[in-house]
Amino acid sequence: MAVTACQGLGFVVSLIGIAGIIAATCMDQWSTQDLYNNPVTAVFNYQGLWRSCVRESSGFTECRGYFTLLGLPAMLQAVRALMIVGIVLGAIGLLVSIFALKCIRIGSMEDSAKANMTLTSGIMFIVSGLCAIAGVSVFANMLVTNFWMSTANMYTGMGGMVQTVQTRYTFGAALFVGWVAGGLTLIGGVMMCIACRGLAPEETNYKAVSYHASGHSVAYKPGGFKASTGFGSNTKNKKIYDGGARTEDEVQSYPSKHDYV
């Protein structure tokens, strides 16, 4: 039950994360005009990965696409690439994880196959989240660099009589959406990987539990605490039988094949 919940939650969290990555990629407000310490302009500039926009105080907003590939900064191209890779990986991960969900039955698919698919989608989500975080962080770094460069220009280029309004850009809403979305996708991916461990049939643990079942002297120790089997912690030895989760002790109360030897 816990495995199904972890897998389901991982899927939902990743789904929200990828939706956020798509939203961030499409948003126009990656960088917005810095209004602090600036004369109050009647136009507000903001830029996205695909177009730049100007909102006039009149109420009119004009957006212009970047209709060039070669003329764009390499960093912007890199950010675009990272975000697209993140979206593609995330979309594939979602597709894989749908079939991997324990609550969905597809023919006679074995648990091992579902476990592999869960792990695959988990890794895809992790990489997708990292791509988004990296893309947003690269853009943010680019903004910080440009911000301080334009600030320096502001104070050095004031020798003449005529002043020029230097437009500086700061973090836009899309950056925060991207960071959060990337983080959610990453968390979702980790949850899927954790769920995969619970889905995979652990042969050694099963045998270990069965083997110790005949040794009634080691089933309980004075004081009432459970004895360890020697194969990792007790939590790892929680197995699923007949569709229900049972502890080591519960398993021992059922006849095992070794009891009749």
Epitope: A42, V43, V54, S58, G59, Q163, V165
Partner: antibody, heavy 118, light 113 residues
């Protein structure tokens, strides 16, 4: 077509207040901002401030802060400007003007003459 | 506040001649975001409200005769009337539409000989 109909001429005594109106028609009232412009007889134009009918947000020229108050009524598509503590310096023609591309004013009211005797 | 300086005033020309008036701003009106200059030209005839001629420094408003041309960038702008007609007798104002408060020039009065 876009039309801005302003209220009639006002004669006010010094220290009093007047409220001028500008009724808009022929376009979606909440889409464009509305400005008020002052013109004293034989003189140039002075921008007073602007209001966004959608939100009610305003921008004022510092020179007119405390003197002019802009409001908008979406239900009647009307913008108002209240002028307070009137002096002879406030005697002028006041225009309402609807914003357009480039923050320019493409549509103007016919103007309201406010007279404050010295 | 941005100071808009217009010259000459008055501007006297013969009908059919070219008239050019200048407008200088104390700060650049160029917006780097869209590379547009936020300067507007108006024509005002006696007893009438101003009429929009040119916005974004060079974009002619629809219905305005093509003899009116706006040009310039940054801080220096001009309005040219290629062939002055009798009905062009008016005061011409330039306006800063970029930085609050919006400011107008003192106007150039066009007179016909």
């Amino acid at each position: 077509q876009v039309q801005l109909q302003q209220s009639g001429a006002e004669l006010a005594r010094p220290g009093a207040s007047v409220k001028l109106s500008c009724k808009a028609s022929g376009y979606t009232f909440t889409v464009w901002s509305m400005s008020w412009v002052k013109q004293r007889t034989g003189q140039g134009l002075q921008w007073i401030g602007e209001i966004y009918p959608k939100s009610g947000n305003t921008h004022y020229n510092e020179k007119f802060k405390g003197k002019a108050t802009l409001t908008a009524d979406k239900s009647s598509s009307t913008v108002y400007m209240q002028l307070s503590s009137l002096t002879s310096e406030d005697s002028a023609v006041y225009f309402c003007a609807r914003a357009y591309y480039g923050n320019s004013f493409a549509y103007w009211g016919q103007g309201t003459l406010v007279t404050v005797p010295a | 506040d941005i100071v808009m300086t217009q010259s000459p005033s008055p501007l006297t020309v013969t009908a059919g001649e070219k008239a050019t008036m200048s407008c200088k701003s104390s700060q650049s009106l160029l917006n780097s975001g869209n590379q547009r200059n936020y300067l507007t030209w108006y024509q005002q005839k006696p007893g009438q409200p101003p009429k929009l001629l040119i916005y974004w420094a060079s974009t002619r408003e629809s219905g305005v005769p093509d003899r009116f041309t706006g040009s310039g960038s940054g801080t220096d702008f001009s309005l040219t009337i290629s062939s002055v007609q009798a009905e062009d007798l008016a005061v011409y104002y330039c306006q800063n539409d970029f930085i609050y408060p919006f400011t107008f020039g003192s106007g150039t009065k066009l007179e016909i000989k």
